[in-house]
Interface confidence: medium
C-alpha cells in the first residue's frame, strides 16, 4: 500500500497530507488484487495533480472514487475507460479548470460531485450545466466558473453563444421489411458546435455499412435476418455539450419455422411442447394421423411464452388414453410461407395388455424362462421418467 495510504481487501484510502502522494495510488504486484477494490478515497493530497490514462484501469471493480481537498488539475480522456462499474465520483474542492464529458459518457453514474473547482467558463463545461438541469433540484450543486473578467459566475447562469445540444433526425422508410431484403436509413444532424454523428446498431446480426459525413449519414442494411426483428437502430449526434439520438425499431417479416417439437411430457396436463418462430404471428394447425385435429377444451393449443417473434407453447391434452396415441403434425403458416414437423406420441398402452399382464402376477416376464432379472437388460430407452413395464415402448412411461 503506498505511503500516506491504508489498504484493505476492498478499499484504499489516502488522507494523510504528510508526506502525501504525488500520483494516483497503485498496489504492489503481490499485495491485494486490484480487481477487488470497490472504493478509493483520497483527501488532502495537494500534490496529486493528474489522473493518467492507465492509473485507474486495474481497478475494474471500482464503484466509488473520491478525491477531495486535493490538487487535481487534469484527468486524461480515457482514464475511466475500463471502470464500467463506477457509480459515484466526488471531485470536490480540487483545481479542475475544465472537464470533458468524454471522460464519463460510457459510464452510468448516479453521482458526479464537482463543487469547489475553479472551472473556466467555456463551452467545454456546458455539458455540466446541461447535466445539472436534467437532474432533479435536490441534487443540484452550487457550481461556478470564472469568466474572462476572472469573475465567479454560477454555472446555472452561464450563457455561451454557439454552444448548445445537438439534434439528430432519422429519415426512415417504413421499417417493416421482409427477411432477406435490404434497406437504407438516412440521418441528418445539426448543432453548434458541429456534432459528430454515428450509428448505434446494438447487436444487429444483419450485414450493415454506413457512410457518414459530419452532418449527414446513411446506413445500409443488407440481407436482413429474422433475428433482427424488434431491434432498435439509433442515429446519434454528439458534441461537447451532449448528445441527441433518434431511433427506429426494425420489424422483419419472415416465414415460420418450427424450431422445436418434442414427444409429450406429463405435468399437470400432457403437453406436446413446441417452439415456433415467425412474423407476422403464424397460424397454427395440428393434424392427428394425417387428419385435421379439431381442438376442444380437452385438446387445445396453449402459448405459454412469447418472445417477440418466437412462441413457446404446448398442444395440451387432458387425460389422453391409448386412443390418442399416434402421429401429431404441427403446421405453422403465415403469408410468407409455412413449416411443418411431426412427432409420434405415446400416452398409454393397451389397457389390460401393456400393463404387465395380470397385475396380481408381477413376474409374468420371467415365467418359463428361468432367467435372472438382470438378463432382461435395459428394456426402456432414452428417458428418465417412470420405468415402464412395456419393454416395447421406448418412452419409458408408465402405462
Amino acid at each position: 500500500c503506498p505511503t500516506s495510504c491504508k489498504c484493505s481487501a476492498s478499499r484504499i484510502w489516502c488522507s494523510d497530507p504528510s508526506p502525501g502522494i504525488v500520483a494516483f495510488p497503485r498496489l504492489e504486484p503481490n499485495s491485494v488484487d486490484p480487481e477487488n477494490i470497490t472504493e478509493i478515497f483520497i483527501a488532502n493530497q495537494k500534490r496529486l495533480e493528474i489522473i493518467n490514462e492507465d492509473d485507474v484501469e486495474a481497478y475494474v471493480g471500482l464503484r466509488n472514487l473520491t478525491i477531495v481537498d486535493s490538487g487535481l488539475k487534469f484527468v486524461a480522456h480515457k482514464a475511466f475507460l475500463k471502470n464500467s462499474n463506477l457509480q459515484h465520483i466526488n471531485f470536490t474542492r480540487n483545481k479542475l479548470t475544465s472537464l470533458s464529458r468524454k471522460h464519463f459518457r460510457h459510464l452510468d453514474l448516479s453521482e458526479l460531485i464537482l463543487v469547489g473547482n475553479p472551472f473556466t467558463c467555456s463551452c467545454d463545461i456546458m455539458w455540466i450545466k446541461t447535466l445539472q438541469e436534467a437532474k432533479s433540484s435536490p441534487d443540484t450543486q452550487d457550481l461556478y466558473c470564472l469568466n474572462e473578467s476572472s469573475k465567479n459566475i454560477p454555472l446555472a447562469n452561464l450563457q455561451i453563444p454557439n454552444c448548445g445540444l445537438p439534434s439528430a433526425n432519422l429519415a426512415a422508410p417504413n421499417l417493416t421489411v421482409e427477411e432477406g431484403k435490404s434497406i437504407t436509413l438516412s440521418c441528418s444532424v445539426a448543432g453548434d458546435p458541429v456534432p459528430n454523428m454515428y450509428w448505434d446498431v446494438g447487436n444487429l446480426v444483419s450485414k450493415h455499412m454506413n457512410e457518414t459525413s459530419h452532418t449527414q449519414g446513411s446506413l445500409r442494411i443488407t440481407n436482413i435476418s429474422s433475428d433482427d426483428s424488434g431491434k432498435q437502430i439509433s442515429c446519434v449526434a454528439e458534441n461537447l455539450v451532449g448528445e441527441d439520438q433518434d431511433s427506429v425499431n426494425l420489424t422483419v417479416h419472415f416465414a415460420p419455422t418450427i424450431t422445436f417439437l418434442e414427444s409429450p411430457t406429463s405435468d399437470h396436463h400432457w403437453c406436446i411442447p413446441f417452439t415456433v418462430k415467425g412474423n407476422p404471428k403464424p397460424a397454427l394447425q395440428w393434424f392427428y394421423n394425417g387428419a385435421i385435429l379439431n381442438e376442444s377444451k380437452y385438446i387445445c393449443t396453449k402459448i405459454h411464452v412469447t418472445n417477440h417473434t418466437e412462441y413457446h407453447g404446448c398442444l395440451q391434452l387432458d387425460n389422453p388414453t391409448h386412443m390418442n396415441n399416434g402421429d401429431y403434425t404441427l403446421i405453422a403458416k403465415n403469408e410468407y410461407g409455412k413449416d411443418e414437423k411431426q412427432i409420434s406420441a405415446h400416452f398409454m398402452g393397451w389397457p389390460g395388455i401393456d400393463d404387465g399382464a395380470n397385475p396380481n402376477y408381477p413376474d409374468v416376464i420371467y415365467e418359463d424362462y428361468g432367467t435372472a432379472a438382470n438378463d432382461i437388460g435395459d428394456t426402456t430407452n432414452r428417458s428418465n421418467e417412470i420405468p415402464s413395464t412395456d419393454v416395447t415402448d421406448k418412452t419409458g412411461r408408465e402405462h
Epitope: 416376464i365 418359463d368 413395464t389 421406448k394
Partner: antibody, heavy 117, light 108 residues
Framework: QVQLQQSGGGVVQPGRSLRLSCAAS????????MHWVRQAPGKGLEWVAV????????YYADSVKGRFTISRDNSRNTLDLQMNSLRAEDTAVYYC??????????WGQGTMVTVSS | LSELTQDPAVSVALGQTVRITCQGD??????ASWYQQKPGQAPVLVIY???NRPSGIPDRFSGSDSGKTASLTITGAQAEDEADYYC???????????FGGGTKLTVL
C-alpha cells in the same frame, strides 16, 4: 411343457363363418394376453387380434374389425377366434400366440383356413 | 397405417456377420421384436426390447436400435440360421401391432 394346441381350420365358402380354437397347457393361462396372427400362403405375418389376460379388453386389425371376435375361457384354458363374413383374402395359416409385455414368446403350430367357392 | 420395411432378401457367407434392418416411423416410439421362421414352422421369438434374448436363443443373435431403424445382427452365421426373419412393433398410434414384410436370409 409350455404348449399351444390349435384346432378348427378347414375350407369354407366366402361369406360363411368358422371358429378357431387354441388350447393352452404348461403355464398359467389366465396370466397372459393372447394374440392371433395369420400368414397368407407365400406371404408375411399379419397381426389379427389380441385379448387381455382377463378377457376385458380386445383389439383388432382394421382388416378384420367387425367380422372377427376374439374370446377366451380361463377356466378351460382356451382361446377362440370366431370368424364371420369370411373373404378370399382371409385365406391363411392362423397362429395363436402367447403375449408378454415384450413380444409373442410361445406360438401354436398353426391351422390352415381356406376361403374358396 | 404406418409400415415396417425390411429388405426382402439378404445372404451371408457361413461364419460371417449379417445385419437385417427394419425401418418405420413407429420405431421412434417402440422397440422391435424379432422372429425367426423356418419353412413349415411357427415363428420363434429371438430378440425383444432393446437387445434381449429369450433363453435358448444363441448369443450370436443381437439387436440394436437407432431412431427409426431397428437391426438384428447375427455374428458368425450358421447354416441353421437360414430362415425368414420378421420384425414386429406397434404402428405409430400404438393401437395396432405391425410386422415387417420379412427378410429371407440365405447362408452360403
Amino acid at each position: 411343457q409350455v404348449q399351444l394346441q390349435q384346432s378348427g381350420g378347414g375350407v369354407v365358402q366366402p361369406g360363411r363363418s368358422l371358429r378357431l380354437s387354441c388350447a393352452a397347457s404348461g403355464f398359467t393361462f389366465s396370466n397372459y394376453a393372447m394374440h392371433w396372427v395369420r400368414q397368407a400362403p407365400g406371404k408375411g405375418l399379419e397381426w389379427v387380434a389380441v385379448i387381455s389376460y382377463d378377457g376385458s379388453n380386445e383389439y383388432y386389425a382394421d382388416s378384420v374389425k367387425g367380422r372377427f371376435t376374439i374370446s377366451r375361457d380361463n377356466s378351460r384354458n382356451t382361446l377362440d377366434l370366431q370368424m364371420n363374413s369370411l373373404r378370399a383374402e382371409d385365406t391363411a395359416v392362423y397362429y395363436c400366440a402367447r403375449g408378454t409385455n415384450y413380444g409373442m414368446d410361445v406360438w401354436g403350430q398353426g391351422t390352415m383356413v381356406t376361403v374358396s367357392s | 397405417l404406418s409400415e415396417l420395411t425390411q429388405d426382402p432378401a439378404v445372404s451371408v457367407a457361413l461364419g460371417q456377420t449379417v445385419r437385417i434392418t427394419c425401418q418405420g416411423d413407429s420405431l421412434r416410439s417402440y422397440y422391435a421384436s424379432w422372429y425367426q421362421q423356418k419353412p413349415g414352422q411357427a415363428p420363434v421369438l429371438v430378440i425383444y426390447g432393446k437387445n434381449n434374448r429369450p433363453s435358448g436363443i444363441p448369443d450370436r443373435f443381437s439387436g440394436s436400435d437407432s431412431g427409426k431403424t431397428a437391426s438384428l445382427t447375427i455374428t458368425g452365421a450358421q447354416a441353421e440360421d437360414e430362415a425368414d426373419y420378421y420384425c414386429q412393433s406397434r404402428d405409430t398410434t400404438g393401437n395396432y401391432l405391425l410386422f415387417g414384410g420379412g427378410t429371407k436370409l440365405t447362408v452360403l
